[in-house]
């Protein structure tokens, strides 16, 4: 069974846990923080955004969307192209979706290959 590696599972986890600051218990808060940090690191290091792309943050209901104003955060700032100080190159252009100022590629295609190769040899 290869369901673990399907994008839908990643998507479900990301939408439910990323920046979810109002979980039912402390254990969930700890998990949510871990998921948020992992996604932030992944999007920054791999220059990618969401599971399938930036539209994930707009198409679906998510903790991130509940926590953030759409005009200010159409997607996390980690989706923006960054300068060497890890600041958005141009935050306004990133928020407006101007090509070259945000990452259009989803993270799943970048991590699924290595993960599947590792799991299935």
């Amino acid at each position: 069974q290869r369901d673990f590696f399907t994008p839908n599972l990643f998507l479900k986890q990301m939408l439910e846990r990323y920046q979810n600051n109002s979980p039912p218990n402390n254990d969930d808060q700890w998990k949510n923080n871990g998921v948020t940090k992992t996604w932030d690191r992944l999007m920054l290091q791999d220059n990618c955004c969401g599971v399938n792309g930036p539209s994930d943050w707009q198409k679906y209901t998510s903790a991130f969307r509940t926590e953030n104003n759409d005009a200010d955060y159409p997607w996390p700032r980690q989706c923006c192209v960054m300068n060497n100080l890890k600041e958005p190159l141009n935050l306004e252009a990133c928020k407006l979706g101007v090509p070259g100022f945000y990452h259009n590629q989803g993270c799943y295609e970048l991590i699924s290959g290595p993960m599947n190769r590792h799991a299935w040899g």
């Epitope: 300068n83 060497n84 100080l85 600041e87 958005p88 190159l89 141009n90 935050l91 306004e92 252009a93």
Partner: antibody
Framework: EVQLVESGGGLVQPKGSLKLSCAAS????????MNWVRQAPGKGLEWVAR??????????YYADSVKDRFTISRDDSESMLYLQMNNLKTEDTAMYYC??????????????WGQGTLVTVSA | DIQMTQTTSSLSASLGDRVTISCRAS??????LNWYQQKPDGTVKLLIY???RLHSGVPSRFSGSGSGTDYSLTISNLEQEDIATYFC?????????FGSGTKLEIK
């Protein structure tokens, strides 16, 4: 030609205030991050403050030595950069330079410098 | 904060000499290293950014090299107008920090 002209320096007493200005010309001021860098007499250069462009929410950054005392601001319509200095200390005595930052992916370089304006804090 | 160290505070050389000024960072700064020239009248100019990129209008006798924590500025054929103090600066992280400077004098 890029030009940065500072003004507003002078003699001020400890705990006093002073506002420095910098008139910029020869480039699209509103698209660049701007900085203040200072140099105490006979000493090295010290970065003081930075302000990003409007498209980056005018984000500001300060050296620990001036945090909560100095405020950097800008007026894009007039191509002016400012440094409001409050609660001045004798160790703030320095030449203050207005500096235009580099652009692109690597932003941590100071491409153009003004001639400086001298601030002396003394009783 | 990242500390920048210029161990040589002053340097004497003859016109036409090849001069090298060094700079060390307290941690890896990923080549985000810049060099500035300050003339005796206080005028400051950028010479080199990102370790080795020559700023516009800077003579080609100036060059930069290095990686990790160790960097250097070289003037291949010293001229009278090069008499100045040279500062290195890291642009890797805030706060931006400078070396203490190396004053270049004529023998």
């Amino acid at each position: 030609e890029v030009q940065l002209v500072e003004s507003g320096g002078g003699l001020v007493q400890p705990k006093g205030s002073l506002k420095l200005s910098c008139a910029a010309s020869g480039f699209s001021f509103n698209t660049y991050a701007m900085n203040w860098v200072r140099q105490a007499p006979g000493k090295g250069l010290e970065w003081v403050a930075r302000i990003r462009s409007k498209s980056n929410n005018y984000a500001t950054y300060y050296a620990d030595s001036v945090k909560d005392r100095f405020t950097i601001s800008r007026d894009d319509s007039e191509s002016m950069l400012y440094l409001q200095m409050n609660n001045l200390k004798t160790e703030d005595t320095a030449m203050y330079y207005c500096v235009r930052q580099g652009d692109g992916y690597y932003v941590g370089w100071f491409a153009y410098w003004g001639q400086g304006t001298l601030v002396t804090v003394s009783a | 904060d990242i500390q920048m160290t210029q161990t040589t505070s002053s340097l004497s050389a003859s016109l036409g000499d090849r001069v090298t000024i060094s700079c060390r960072a307290s941690q890896d700064i990923s080549n985000y290293l810049n060099w500035y020239q300050q003339k005796p009248d206080g005028t400051v100019k950028l010479l080199i950014y990102y370790t080795s990129r020559l700023h516009s209008g800077v003579p080609s006798r100036f060059s930069g090299s290095g990686s990790g924590t160790d960097y250097s500025l070289t003037i291949s054929n010293l001229e009278q107008e090069d008499i100045a103090t040279y500062f290195c600066q890291q642009g890797n992280t805030l706060p931006f920090t400078f070396g203490s400077g190396t004053k270049l004098e004529i023998k």
